[in-house]
């Protein structure tokens, strides 16, 4: 009774095809699969950026898989052939491990990269990026991004620099079409002719670094004697109502009365008769049903109202503002 | 159910050109990598250069420079032009195919008999 044996997988590699991040694990089946031919082989892979503690692991009946690293580091992975149970008369067999391994032969030191990268995807529509030079570089450096998201055939280049003093110091993006709740790949090289420049690799996702616009149309409406409802709108643009928080500042007669955090375009504040003077203002940012993070917009302009009858002037604006 | 056919192989001189041709036909729903391996009796085959997902192309050791590796989809058929040809490039030149059958829901690998390219004076 002979013990079954599988050779690993052939061929196997990591092949970079310039999507600054996204790669392809690929491999071919082990030698000898004759005697299995009535078997469908399943190859257990795991991968990870040199650093990391964990492995992710993935398990296909495929010839390649493919996912996001992040190129600042090297990248290794792992692959063996499993025949299931089926096959082996009731245990699995695993293979030897064939291991490979990716980077990018970086150029450079470190201080030369970009400094500070910040972007920010404004109101969900116009995306813009922007950095420091890398320390002790001279004023021939240049620095040129580099985008890809799937659905692009190729990395495009930054059409639409921000310069100051004659370097690269920002991207403003064309529209994105299709291009949110997917990984966004950002490279951001340099030349200099006086020394090597190292890249930088970025990933995110658009739709949490979105910066929406202030909400507008503030107003107030007197509800009953000690109720007042503070009503704004969503700003003009895509973003739906249901992708909104919002945090909004209540000041009443020049002392803070309360900040509060609401999901709808309505907040109801209990008064007292006292009141001479309420202000309002309202900031948005998106919730978490449609990102994982996100950044609040500006304040809106303040919306005031003073004067002893504040409850006979709100009653007049609110029927103004229906009629 | 998967046949690929390879010819374009033969004698040539040293510093001359072949092009070699592998057409796939058969029941194969869609083509995902094509690449040429070569073989020398008693040693190991190498992968020679590829299109792999996104039409990426790679090419291994010597025949950086030297090869260009093509595709005619309509065709279903991938070209190895081979030039500046030298005695070490002298092999057995075998087609792959990693591609899903019609009747298949993963990835197969598909390899064609060989040419032999012999570079000789």
């Known amino acids: 009774d002979t013990e079954i044996k599988v050779n690993p997988p052939q061929d196997f590699e990591i092949v970079d095809p310039g999507y600054l991040g996204y790669l392809y694990l690929q491999w071919q089946p082990p030698l000898s699969l004759d005697h299995f031919k009535e078997c469908t082989v399943e190859y257990e892979l795991k991968y990870r950026n040199i650093g990391s503690e964990t492995w992710k692991t993935i398990i296909t009946k495929n010839l390649h898989y493919k996912d996001g690293f992040d190129l600042n580091k090297g990248i290794e992975a792992k692959i063996h052939t499993l025949l299931p149970w089926q096959c082996t008369n009731g245990s699995e067999v695993q293979s030897s491990w064939a291991e490979t391994t990716y980077w990018i032969s970086p150029q450079g030191i470190p201080e030369t990269k970009v400094q500070d990268m910040d972007c920010v995807y404004y109101n969900w529509q116009y995306l813009l990026c922007s950095w420091k030079p890398g320390i002790g570089v001279l004023l021939d450096t240049n620095y040129n991004l580099f985008y890809w998201y799937e659905g692009l055939d190729h990395a495009l280049q930054c059409v639409d620099y921000i310069k100051a003093d004659g370097q690269n110091i920002g991207c403003r993006f064309p529209y994105l079409e299709a291009s949110d709740y997917k990984d966004f790949y950002i490279c951001v090289n340099g030349s200099s002719e006086n020394k090597p420049i190292r890249s930088s690799y970025f990933t995110f996702q658009l739709q949490n670094i979105v910066k929406p616009l202030p909400p507008v149309y503030l107003t107030f409406t007197r509800e009953s004697s000690c109720e007042i409802k503070l009503k704004w709108s969503i700003p003009l643009g895509p973003i739906p109502a249901r992708c909104f928080d919002y945090e909004i500042e209540i000041r009443e007669d020049d002392t803070t009365l309360v900040t509060a955090t609401v999901e709808n375009e309505t907040y109801t504040l209990k008064t007292t008769n006292e009141t001479r003077q309420l202000c309002f203002v309202v900031r948005s940012k998106v919730n978490i049903y449609c990102s994982d993070d996100g950044i609040w917009s500006e304040w809106s302009d303040k919306q005031c109202w003073e004067g002893e009858d504040l409850s006979k002037k709100t009653l007049l604006r609110h029927h103004h503002h229906h009629h | 159910q998967v046949q690929l056919q390879e010819s374009g192989g033969g004698l040539v001189q040293p510093g001359g050109s072949l092009r070699l041709s592998c057409e796939v036909s058969?029941?194969?729903?869609?083509?995902?990598?094509m690449a040429w391996y070569r073989q020398v009796p008693g040693k190991e085959r190498e992968m020679v250069a590829q299109?792999?997902?996104?039409?990426?192309?790679k090419y291994y050791g010597s025949a950086k420079g030297r090869f260009t590796i093509s595709k005619d989809s309509a065709k279903n058929a991938v070209y190895l032009q081979m030039n500046s040809l030298k005695p070490e490039d002298t092999a057995v030149y075998r087609c792959?195919?990693?591609?899903?059958?019609?009747?298949?829901?993963?990835?197969?690998?598909?390899w064609g008999q060989g040419t032999q390219v012999t570079v000789s004076s």
């Open positions: 299109i792999t997902y996104g039409d990426t192309i």
């Open positions: 058969g029941s194969i729903s869609s083509i995902n990598r």
């Open positions: 792959n195919i990693v591609g899903v059958l019609t009747t298949g829901h993963y990835e197969n690998s598909f």
